[in-house]
C-alpha cells in the first residue's frame, strides 16, 4: 500500500477579520494509526493550534467527526479571526508510539492571510487658528488594516486636493498596517463653512470608502474690518457715532471706545448677525453730547478679536462747527442700544 500523504490543497486562504477560517487537510490512508495535530509555523518554535488527542482549543472546530474510524478529513475551522492569526498552518500526522506519539508526515502548509478593515479616519487640524491666505496642515490617520494596499484622497468642499504626502507603515510585511497623511490647505475668507475630508478606500470596504472630516470653522480666523461713522441724532447737540465691525470669525470679540485716548466703555459682542459665508457683523454706537466739549474729540473704536492684538479705527469729532452728517449706517445689519453722554 502507498505511504500516507498529508494533503493541504490550499496554498493560501484569505479571510476577513472577525470571520471563520477553514483550513483543509486530508490524509490519503488510515495507516499508520495516530492523531493529527495542527501547528502554526514549521520549526521547533511552532505553536500548537489543535491536537486531536487532548487540549483546550476554544476557537477551533473540526469540519468532520474525527472519532469515526474511517475518517481521513482533518480540516479545521478557526473562529473570530484577527490579524494576529496570520501565518502558515501545517497539518501534521503523528504515528502512535510509546510513551509518546512520533511525528510522521506534514502537509505543505496553508498561508492564512487576514483582511482587516481600516479604522475610521481621524482628521486633525492645526493647534492654533490661522487667517485667510495662510497655508495650514491637516493630518489624517487610519489603523489596523490588511492587506497593505490602500488609497487615500483629500477633498475640500468636494474638490480633490493634490498637495499632500502619505505614508503607510510599516514599510515591510506586517499583520496590520497604518496610514498617515498630511495635506496642505490654503485658507480663504469664505472658508468658515468649508470642510476638509480625508477618504480612505480599501479592499475590505467593498467600494464604500471611509471618511473623516474637519470643519475649517475650527481652524480659521477671519479678522474684522472696522468702520467708524457719525450721524446727527435727536437734538442738534447730540451726535451718534457708530463702529461697524464686519466679516469676523469666530464670534469672540471685545470692543473698547476711547475718547481722546481714555477708555470710555468696553463691551463684548453678543447680539451679532451672521452673514451667508458664516462670518459675523456687529455694531456698537456711542451717543456724544457735543455741547459739553470745547475742543475737537478723537473717538477711537478698538477691537480685540479672538485674543489677537487690538485693531482700531478713529474718528475726529468737530465740535466747533455745527455737526453735519458724515457717514451713513447702511452697512449695519444690527443696531445696539448703547448710549454714552459725554458731560
Amino acid at each position: 500500500e502507498e505511504e500516507l500523504q498529508v494533503i493541504q490543497p490550499d496554498k493560501s486562504v484569505l479571510v476577513a477579520a472577525g470571520e471563520t477560517a477553514t483550513l483543509r487537510c486530508t490524509a490519503t490512508s488510515l495507516i499508520p494509526v495516530g492523531p493529527i495535530q495542527w501547528f502554526r509555523g514549521a520549526g521547533p518554535g511552532r505553536e500548537l493550534i489543535y491536537n486531536q488527542k487532548e487540549g483546550h482549543f476554544p476557537r477551533v472546530t473540526t469540519v468532520s467527526d474525527l472519532t469515526k474510524r474511517n475518517n481521513m478529513d482533518f480540516s479545521i475551522r478557526i473562529g473570530n479571526i484577527t490579524p494576529a492569526d496570520a501565518g502558515t498552518y501545517y497539518c501534521v500526522k503523528f504515528r502512535k508510539g510509546s510513551p509518546d506519539d512520533v511525528e510522521f508526515k506534514s502537509g505543505a502548509g496553508t498561508e492564512l492571510s487576514v483582511r482587516a478593515k481600516p479604522s475610521a479616519p481621524v482628521v486633525s487640524g492645526p493647534a492654533a487658528r490661522a487667517t485667510p491666505q495662510h497655508t495650514v496642515s491637516f493630518t489624517c490617520e487610519s489603523h489596523g488594516f490588511s492587506p497593505r494596499d490602500i488609497t487615500l484622497k483629500w477633498f475640500k468642499n468636494g474638490n480633490e486636493l493634490s498637495d499632500f504626502q502619505t505614508n503607510v507603515d510599516p514599510v515591510g510585511e506586517s499583520v496590520s498596517y497604518s496610514i498617515h497623511s498630511t495635506a496642505k490647505v490654503v485658507l480663504t475668507r469664505e472658508d468658515v463653512h468649508s470642510q476638509v475630508i480625508c477618504e480612505v478606500a480599501h479592499v475590505t470596504l467593498q467600494g464604500d470608502p471611509l471618511r473623516g472630516t474637519a470643519n475649517l470653522s475650527e481652524t480659521i480666523r477671519v479678522p474684522p474690518t472696522l468702520e467708524v461713522t457719525q450721524q446727527p441724532v435727536r437734538a442738534e447737540n447730540q451726535v451718534n457715532v457708530t463702529c461697524q465691525v464686519r466679516k469676523f470669525y469666530p464670534q469672540r470679540l471685545q470692543l473698547t471706545w476711547l475718547e481722546n485716548g481714555n477708555v470710555s466703555r468696553t463691551e463684548t459682542a453678543s447680539t451679532v448677525t451672521e452673514n451667508k459665508d458664516g462670518t459675523y457683523n456687529w455694531m456698537s454706537w456711542l451717543l456724544v453730547n457735543v455741547s459739553a466739549h470745547r475742543d475737537d474729540v478723537k473717538l477711537t473704536c478698538q477691537v480685540e478679536h479672538d485674543g489677537q492684538p487690538a485693531v482700531s479705527k478713529s474718528h475726529d469729532l468737530k465740535v466747533s462747527a455745527h455737526p453735519k452728517e458724515q457717514g451713513s449706517n447702511t452697512a449695519a445689519e444690527n443696531t445696539g442700544s448703547n448710549e454714552r453722554n459725554i458731560y
Partner: antibody
C-alpha cells in the same frame, strides 16, 4: 497578560548541578514551545534549549547536550531546566521565553543568575 | 551554525535623529517557500530582559512604536529608528529564527543618547 518568572539560580561549583524553574501564566501554556536563552557576562545572547508544543520534542545547543535537560509540566504551567556537569562557561543570566510561532522569542522572563565558580 | 554579525557595536545619537544599525548572516535567511526572511530584532534596556521588536525581518510586534522599522532580505538586514527618543537607549540584538538549529544571535549594537 503573559508572565514568566524564573527561579533556582545561584552559585555552584564546576561539575555541580542546578535546576531552574519557570512559572508561566496568562496564556495556554501547552500550546506554545518554551525555551531557555542565556546571556553571558559579556552580554552575548545564546539559545540553550527548547521544549516544543504538541509532543515531547526537545532541542538543545550542542555544547549543553547530555548535560542539560529541558522538561515541562503542562498541568502546572511550568518549564524546567536541569543542569549538571556545570562549567564556568555556563555562567550567565538564564531567561525563560515563550517562543513565537516560527522561532523568535516573543516573551521573556526577568531572568535568574547562574554563577559557576570554584 | 549560522553566524550573525552586527555593526556598529555601539553608536551615540541625539534625540530626533535617524538611527540605522545592521545585521549580517553567514547564509541566507530567506525561505523560498513563503518568501519570508527569518530574522528578529530585540531591544534590551539597561537592567531589563530583552523585548521582541520585529520578526520576519519587518513585521513589527504588537505595541512596538512605528519609529522602529526592520528591512532587508537574504543576508543583509537593517533596523532603523526613524526619530530616536531618550527611552530608546538600549542594546539591540538580531536573531535568525530559521528552522535550522541552533537559533543564533548577533553580538548586539549599543545605542547611546548624546
Amino acid at each position: 497578560e503573559v508572565m514568566l518568572v524564573e527561579s533556582g539560580g545561584g552559585l555552584v561549583k564546576p561539575g555541580g548541578s542546578l535546576k531552574l524553574t519557570c512559572a508561566a501564566s496568562g496564556f495556554t501554556f501547552s500550546n506554545h514551545a518554551m525555551s531557555w536563552v542565556r546571556q553571558t557576562p559579556e552580554k552575548r545572547l545564546e539559545w540553550v534549549a527548547t521544549f516544543g508544543s504538541g509532543g515531547s520534542y526537545t532541542y538543545y545547543l550542542d555544547s549543553v547536550k547530555g548535560r542539560f535537560t529541558v522538561s515541562r509540566d503542562n498541568a502546572k504551567n511550568t518549564l524546567y531546566l536541569q543542569m549538571s556537569s556545570l562549567r564556568s562557561e555556563d555562567t550567565a543570566m538564564y531567561y525563560c521565553s515563550r517562543s513565537g510561532w516560527d522561532g523568535w522569542f516573543a516573551y521573556w522572563g526577568q531572568g535568574t543568575l547562574v554563577t559557576v565558580s570554584a | 551554525d549560522i553566524v550573525m554579525t552586527q555593526s556598529p557595536s555601539s553608536l551615540a545619537m541625539s534625540i530626533g535623529q535617524k538611527v540605522t544599525m545592521n545585521c549580517k548572516s553567514s547564509q541566507s535567511l530567506l525561505n523560498s517557500n513563503n518568501q519570508k526572511n527569518y530574522l528578529a530584532w530585540y531591544q534590551q534596556k539597561p537592567g531589563q530582559s530583552p523585548k521582541l521588536l520585529i520578526y520576519f525581518a519587518s513585521t513589527r510586534e504588537s505595541g512596538v512604536p512605528d519609529r522602529f522599522i526592520g528591512s532587508g532580505s537574504g543576508t543583509d538586514f537593517t533596523l532603523t529608528i526613524s526619530s530616536v527618543q531618550a527611552e530608546d537607549l538600549a542594546n539591540y540584538f538580531c536573531q535568525q529564527h530559521y528552522s535550522t538549529l541552533p537559533w543564533t544571535f548577533g553580538g548586539g549594537t549599543k545605542l547611546e543618547i548624546k
